[in-house]
């Protein structure tokens, strides 16, 4: 969370951003909120990116003003127009690219003053893993697959019964480049699996951490997975 204060004539307004991460090829959101104004005509929102000459996005007098928008963002940005009046200046970024990573500034002007705050935006690829029993293998084996990751993540196996055990000797992880030559498919195999135990496949890079759990008993198999974005700290 980053809170910035303006330095206007009347008084500064508080602008708040939250560091976030974008999944390449998908749509992302750069979060920014500010002290609301009661009239739309006086609200100006400017999004800028460090190292980029043109604007990322500008909204003023109730409309998008894109004459000074940088080419790299053309057709890819939008504010939540209906939410501007209640202090939401968040930016929707379509088709996130690796090159969208960097430091952004959310700059706000209202009839009450000015303010801005920076936001660190990371880009990469992350996806939910799925853990299955590999019936093709000669011994009891689990297979953990996640279709899209970048940068290359680490994969760690854990088990509920053998807490703290190191499974690196009995697992094998491979990374297969996807067709767009950036993201990779993650496949990790765990051997010598015992019944009546819960195993977790944890995939992590500097952007996200995802876990796929599988509980194997003689009568059933239960699966669960979740993904968590690792937001960078406020500067």
């Amino acid at each position: 969370l980053i809170i910035g204060f303006g330095i206007s004539g009347r008084h500064s307004i508080t602008v708040t951003t939250v560091a976030s991460a974008g999944n390449i090829g998908e749509d992302g959101i750069l979060s920014c909120t500010f002290e609301p104004d009661i009239k739309l005509s006086d609200i100006v929102i400017q999004w800028l990116k460090e190292g980029v000459l043109g604007l990322v996005h500008e909204f003023k007098e109730g409309k998008d003003e894109l004459s000074e928008q940088d080419e790299m963002f053309r057709g890819r940005t939008a504010v939540f127009a209906d939410q501007v009046i209640v202090g939401n200046a968040s930016l929707r970024l379509k088709n996130v690219q690796l090159t969208d990573a960097g430091t952004y500034k959310c700059y706000i002007i209202t009839s009450k003053g000015k303010g801005n705050a920076n936001l660190e935006y990371k880009t990469g690829a992350f996806s939910m893993p799925e853990v299955n029993v590999d019936y093709n293998a000669s011994s009891e084996t689990l297979r953990c697959e996640a279709p899209r990751w970048f940068p290359q993540p680490t994969v760690v196996w854990a088990s509920q019964v053998d807490q703290g055990a190191n499974f690196s000797e009995v697992s094998n992880t491979s990374f297969e480049l996807n067709s767009e030559n950036v993201t990779m498919k993650v496949v990790s195999v765990l051997y010598n699996v015992t019944i009546n135990n819960t195993y977790s496949c944890m995939i992590e890079n500097d952007i996200a951490k995802a876990t796929g759990d599988i509980k194997v008993t003689e009568s059933e198999i239960k699966r669960r997975s979740h993904l968590q974005l690792l937001n960078s700290k406020a500067s």
Epitope: E35, G62, I85, V86, K112
Partner: antibody, heavy 117, light 107 residues
Framework: QVQLVQSGAEVKKPGASVKVSCKAS????????MHWVRQAPGQGLEWIAA????????DYNQKFKGKAKITAVTSTSTVYMELSSLRSEDTAVYYC??????????WGQGTMVTVSS | EIVMTQSPATLSLSPGERATLTCKAS??????VAWYQQKPGQAPKLLIS???YRYTGVPDRFSGSGSGTDFTLTISSLEPEDFAVYYC?????????FGGGTKVEIK
């Protein structure tokens, strides 16, 4: 859930003053504007003024400057509107309304102010 | 100030019919228009915000459209509970202003 509870009906003589209250609950009181709107009997809606409790910024309809004064007490999440030099034309229902997720998405039940000699 | 003119003043229709209410701003207000429904003895209720965004819990027979100076509230098929007074309001500039209202009554 968001609730705005207003004070009860008032009957005042011409030239007197009245102070109407609006107590908010269910949201962060200091983060959203609170407005006052009035409606004379059988008439339409008229915006009076607004206050941002976070820093006590106010905005008034020029027509009501000198007539209405709004204040906010953050410790009780209450907004007050004082109307002075009352005249019969000030007879109306006065509503408080706030803008949390959308414009005027929550309203108080209204306070009837009757000015009569 | 921005004047919001609603028409017609009264609309007499039967349940099941389509209602079209219009609101014209005296100057460009972008999309900064909301629509409210008011029944006798009650506070107004928000129906549509920012010209076309249906508020939470509002039936989908209500829809809003328009930008700039011309705005429309449409009720696709009137239900008995829809007979009320409807107001448009602009939040583009201060003073915030409302239209004079359109009364939708049973024919």
């Amino acid at each position: 859930q968001v609730q705005l509870v207003q004070s009860g009906a008032e009957v005042k003589k011409p030239g007197a003053s009245v102070k109407v209250s609006c107590k908010a609950s269910g949201y962060t009181f200091t983060s959203y504007w609170m407005h006052w709107v009035r409606q004379a009997p059988g008439q339409g809606l008229e915006w009076i003024a607004a206050i941002y409790p976070g820093n006590s910024d106010t905005d008034y309809n020029q027509k009501f400057k000198g007539k209405a004064k709004i204040t906010a007490v953050t410790s009780t999440s209450t907004v007050y509107m004082e109307l002075s030099s009352l005249r019969s034309e000030d007879t109306a229902v006065y509503y408080c309304t706030t803008t949390v997720a959308h414009y005027f998405d929550y309203w108080g039940q209204g306070t009837m102010v009757t000015v009569s000699s | 100030e921005i004047v919001m003119t609603q028409s017609p003043a009264t609309l007499s229709l039967s349940p099941g019919e389509r209602a079209t209410l219009t609101c014209k701003a005296s100057q460009d207000v972008s999309f900064a228009v909301a629509w409210y429904q008011q029944k006798p003895g009650q506070a107004p209720k928000l129906l549509i915000s920012s010209a076309s965004y249906r508020y939470t819990g509002v039936p989908d027979r209500f829809s809003g459209s328009g930008s700039g100076t011309d705005f429309t509230l449409t009720i696709s098929s009137l239900e008995p509970e829809d007979f009320a007074v409807y107001y448009c309001q602009q939040h583009y500039n201060t003073p915030l202003t409302f239209g004079g209202g359109t009364k939708v009554e049973i024919k």
